[in-house]
Interface confidence: low
Amino acid sequence: QEFLLRVEPQNPVLSAGGSLFVNCSTDCPSSEKIALETSLSKELVASGMGWAAFNLSNVTGNSRILCSVYCNGSQITGSSNITVYGLPERVELAPLPPWQPVGQNFTLRCQVEGGSPRTSLTVVLLRWEEELSRQPAVEEPAEVTATVLASRDDHGAPFSCRTELDMQPQGLGLFVNTSAPRQLRTFVLPVTPPRLVAPRFLEVETSWPVDCTLDGLFPASEAQVYLALGDQMLNATVMNHGDTLTATATATARADQEGAREIVCNVTLGGERREARENLTVFSFLGPIVNLSEPTAHEGSTVTVSCMAGARVQVTLDGVPAAAPGQTAQLQLNATESDDGRSFFCSATLEVDGEFLHRNSSVQLRVLYGPKIDRATCPQHLKWKDKTRHVLQCQARGNPYPELRCLKEGSSREVPVGIPFFVNVTHNGTYQCQASSSRGKYTLVVVMDIEAFSSH
């Protein structure tokens, strides 16, 4: 009769570092002591006639255990294979490029340390929850790669690496480990430079808008813009509309920037840069300043009119040019009544890079002269009918402007000047029309001859 030695459990699966209770038993009636052969740490827990129980501890790797016993002088054996499973200690997705150009390939790399049995371990690369690659874990550490074509949709997408330890055939389920996700940033930067709209000339201490635009940029909101006038950085307002970026700044030229300068616009995205440059001339254009030696002159006095402007500026005063650019234009006159209110015009011309810039200025002269009554506008003899409506059309002139009053001789009766009034016989008589100002008086005699109204 043949006797057996049973080892239980048969071919167990346990997690790494675990313990296992093993029972060896035989139906041989005359068996000796049962022995357990293993490289693992073991302890006899109990034994009896034809059986022995052992505890195996800290089981870290796959192993085979063997029980043996002598029965009637011959050795009988029994064995069991222990399978150990373990989750990976590290699952890591390698860093992605800081910026990835759309339309170019990039590589996803995942490294897996530990995990057993390797035959049951699979590594999966994911975009969001979409599987990009599924590969078995082979070496230690296992390294899995996948090549991906970057698209706009990938901007901001999380990529991750997942391990699957499939112990379902052993009835233990599917064990999943996932790496920390990494976010990809993709970009499109056109090869064309930005469009830079800037003035050709900029006057010292004046401001002018500067615009820098680049189309076909993605994501436009992530782009950095640098706008500068020479080495002076401009404070730019950046706006995005779809794939178009527009930076607007106000360029203000300082006096120390006079001369040839450059406006620069740099657009940086994804570590790449596009640049546009425009030449600009900063110029100083002072004046023209028109000056009167006496803004208010007395009749007969000499008045000097001068016009000046900055260096290199050609001035022309009332059609008379200055001797050379940067010099003052001057004219002199004897102030007369007819010069009162006269305007003197000065034009200034500055050549900047072959272009002529023009500015004008004027000043008005006041001439002080005594009052006068224009005899042509003030008839000295008036023949009017009684009970009719008339206007005494006298006009005075002078600076300061005189007051004009017409008073009847021998009485304080006054007739209005320049205003319609009803004439009657009492208006008959001689009138003193007097124009008076701080510069004197001027009198003109006006006779009113009122013809009585005939009733038939």
Epitope: E205, T206, S207, T250, R254, A255, D256
Partner: antibody
């Protein structure tokens, strides 16, 4: 912080000259324009002129007909305003102020210097 | 010269009231560069003037938002939404579009 510190009060006789100083600190002196403004007792403000310290270029109010001279000493970051042929109506508080090219307004002012012209 | 005319000369108000000061120029203050260089200053009793508003409507740093400026061309206005005790003093408008720079005659804001 930006500061403009002016020299002390002056009493002058008619026909004399006065020179008021304005020491700037807290910014790069040659980056801003210095202006001078005066205020007669109980009156409004009157602009006298300005200077660009970088170039030393000046612009004056023609009302002062060559009586005013504005200068700078960039080594000490100090601006000066000299008014000659003084008359009693020049009695006023004289202020220095600065402006950047932008916003083109006088953003910081000195404390003022009282100049009294009296015989 | 650009003559600046301010109204009113005196503005008596109660604390918390709204106040409005007008400034009119004898010529347009629009510079050839398109900007308008009209500014507002406040001179508190015994102090130097201080900048409130530059280029019509821009508040200088540190100026409370109860101050606002508006206008164009030749007509400009400074408004205070709620007058506080620290706002009392003389308000001046000023232009720097044309040389010589000129100031308004001032408006005294005082307690009723």
């Amino acid at each position: 912080q930006v500061q403009l510190v002016q020299s002390g009060a002056e009493v002058k006789k008619p026909g004399a000259s006065v020179k008021v100083s304005c020491k700037a600190s807290g910014y790069t002196f040659t980056d801003c324009i210095i202006l001078w403004v005066r205020q007669a007792p109980g009156q409004g403000l009157e602009w006298m002129g300005k200077i660009n310290p970088y170039f030393g270029t000046t612009t004056y109010n023609l009302k002062f007909k060559g009586r005013v001279t504005i200068t700078v000493d960039t080594s000490t970051s100090t601006a000066y305003m000299e008014l000659s042929s003084l008359r009693s109506e020049d009695t006023a508080v004289y202020y220095c102020a600065r402006k950047e090219a932008y916003p083109d307004a006088m953003d910081y002012w000195g404390q003022g210097t009282l100049v009294t012209v009296s015989s | 010269d650009a003559v600046m005319t301010q109204t009113p000369l005196s503005l008596p108000v109660s604390l918390g009231d709204q106040a409005s000061i007008s400034c009119r120029s004898s010529q347009s203050l629009v510079h050839s560069n398109g900007d308008t260089y009209l500014h507002w200053y406040l001179q508190k009793p015994g102090q130097s003037p201080q900048l409130l508003i530059y280029k019509v409507s821009n508040r200088f740093s540190g100026v409370p938002d109860r101050f606002s400026g508006s206008g164009s061309g030749t007509d400009f206005t400074l408004k205070l939404s709620r007058v506080e005790a620290e706002d009392l003093g003389v308000y001046f408008c000023s232009q720097s579009t044309h040389v010589p720079y000129t100031f308004g005659g001032g408006t005294k804001l005082e307690i009723k």
